[in-house]
């Protein structure tokens, strides 16, 4: 049986049940290399409380559809002698990066996971030449996720004092030059995640090979190497390599750009101070507020919720967008779609799409940017579920009693972007974490 998602095969992936202090190791094409789970375990559960291991999915007992992967076991899941067996179920959804498997829940018999990934898309528009896992769990099982930093087009310019060269990088995947045709990056070789531009020439100085690593708390490392044997003439016989160290700052701050800290014989060391290197609970909330010691800030967008069936309306040329954030009030146009953002075609108001659902909400405050994300909307032709990204700005003189109104700024690949100036986005900072 062919592997259903070959681009996910090269790695053993991790997911965590934080509530029960359990780490899952997942290998969807072969078996995880953990002796205690046996030679054919595809999903191995490590219970950190009891320091025990249990296989909850066998690679031999795999069944797959386009969007669901199930691994059965021969282990009875209750003591009543019925024929139910422990199994793992992974639901796949189209995403714009390789993504991460997320633990959802576990019943007595089934361990459920969800995975938004390019591997599950109907079209190849989001697929990279080369991409590696871009998240890691620290020793306290807290997730550090750099997926939001991955550029689908273009690259980051590294801050460097050399006026003759420019070093461009992407995070965890190669630089897509085709989507960004007008830039210096056009000459970058395919597959490169670190591209050195000198005049009109561009050189591959590193490709992603291994996933993100945690070196110690709040320091993550990504290494790129040049795969081809051919040496570059300006590297004094050495093979180029790039090491990017992502550092979680000791207190809340605005974002910085990646900085070159050392360069010798085409070995580039880059340091990037970014809150995306901090654990995810520091940055994100499933509600409309971020507060408490853990987050160092107080943010509460719940006053933006509209009651009584009214919605915010944002004009998008061909479409009108109806938004109702931070609540569970149905938008009338988007009847029974559980939409937080609803897209209605002006020329045909029967054409209605959910552009993100209120159950699928994430509030994120990172590197000074406050963003409310709604995902899980109606599918586009690529298989990607529509999503909306609302970028908030603090404005103490916003109209509409300080609430302000959302403004549609554009759409890329079924992701709808809005900006919203409001006094409720004014962040109150606490002392550091």
């Amino acid at each position: 049986q062919a592997a259903p998602f070959p681009e996910l095969c090269s790695y053993t992936w991790e997911a965590v049940d934080t509530k029960n202090n359990v780490l899952y190791k997942i290998n969807i094409c072969g078996s995880v290399d953990i002796v205690q789970c046996g030679p054919s375990s595809a999903v191995c559960m490590h219970d950190l409380k009891t320091r025990t291991y249990h296989s909850v999915g066998d690679s031999v007992l795999r069944s797959a559809t386009r969007s669901l992967l199930e691994f059965n076991t021969t282990v009875s899941c209750d003591q009543q002698g019925t024929n139910h067996r422990v199994q793992s179920s992974i639901a796949f959804l189209c995403g714009k990066t390789l993504g991460t498997p997320e633990f959802v829940t576990a019943t007595e018999c089934v361990h459920y996971f969800e995975w938004r990934t390019t591997a599950a898309c109907k079209k190849d528009i989001f697929k990279a030449n080369k991409e590696v896992p871009c998240y890691v769990f620290d020793e306290e099982l807290r997730k550090h996720d750099l997926n939001p930093l991955i550029k689908l087009s273009g690259a980051y310019l590294v801050d460097d004092s050399d006026p003759d060269t420019s070093l461009f990088i992407n995070v965890c995947r190669d630089i897509d030059t085709l989507r960004d045709p007008g830039s210096q990056l056009r000459a970058c070789p395919p597959g490169t995640a670190a591209c050195l531009v000198r005049g009109h020439q561009a050189f591959d100085v590193g490709q992603p090979r291994d996933g993100l690593k945690v070196v110690r708390k709040d320091r993550l490392v990504l290494s790129y190497v040049r795969e081809e044997a051919g040496k570059l003439d300006f590297c004094d016989g050495h093979s180029p390599a790039v090491t990017i160290t992502f550092v979680c700052p000791s207190e809340r701050r605005e974002g910085t750009i990646p900085k070159l800290t050392a360069k010798s014989n085409c070995r580039y060391e880059i340091e990037w101070i970014t809150e995306y290197a901090c654990h995810r609970d520091y940055l994100e909330s499933k509600t409309c507020s971020l507060s408490g010691e853990q987050q160092d800030v107080s943010i509460d967008l719940t006053p933006l919720a509209q009651s009584g069936g009214s919605s915010y309306i944002s004009d998008g040329k061909e479409y009108l967008f109806y938004l109702n954030v931070c609540g569970e009030t149905e938008i009338q146009f988007c009847n029974k779609k559980q939409a937080a953002v609803c897209q209605v075609k002006k020329s045909d108001t029967s054409q209605v799409k959910a552009a993100g659902r209120y159950h699928n909400q994430t509030l994120r405050y990172s590197d000074g940017d406050l963003t409310l994300i709604y995902f899980g909307g109606d599918e586009c032709s690529s298989g990607f579920q529509r999503m909306s990204v609302i970028n908030f700005e603090c404005n103490k003189t916003a109209g509409n009693d300080g609430k302000g109104t959302p403004v549609f700024t554009g759409e890329v690949d079924c992701t709808y972007e809005f900006t919203w100036d409001t006094e409720y986005a004014c962040v109150h900072h606490h002392h550091h974490h």
């Epitope: 049940d17 934080t18 509530k19 029960n20 202090n21 359990v22 409380k49 899941c77 209750d78 829940t105 576990a106 019943t107 007595e108 018999c109 361990h111």
Partner: nanobody, 116 residues
């Protein structure tokens, strides 16, 4: 105040059965993962069974097929049903509650003796 109280231990013959109870107070019981451990005389405490907050159960190999862990959220109680008991099951049995927001909470223990 957060407390766990075990009961149901006692003297039983080999091959017999017992049901241990662990009553919790002061916690949102359904949010907690519950574990049973045991400690035989002169030995280290060992894990016996787990009932996670979501409902999955796991057992130590030595008790698999003989012991069953269950819970009743309305009574804030977790149970350990022990069948086909052996002399090597003799120990003090402890229950433990844990959640991401609480430190682990242990009960005082209940003695189980399997002897003819």
């Amino acid at each position: 105040q957060v407390q766990l109280q075990e009961s149901g231990g006692g003297l039983v013959q080999p091959g017999g059965s017992l049901r241990l109870s662990c009553a919790a107070s002061g916690i949102i019981f359904s949010d907690n993962r519950m574990d049973w451990y045991r400690q035989a005389p002169g030995k280290q405490r060992e894990w016996v069974a787990t009932l996670a907050s979501y409902g999955w159960k796991t057992y130590a190999d030595s008790v698999k097929g003989r012991f069953t862990i269950s819970r009743d959220n309305t009574k804030n109680t977790v149970y350990l049903r022990m069948n086909s008991l052996k002399p090597e099951d003799t120990a003090v049995y402890y229950c433990k509650a844990s959640s991401p927001v609480l430190n682990d909470i242990w009960g005082q223990g209940t003695q189980v003796t399997v002897s003819s």
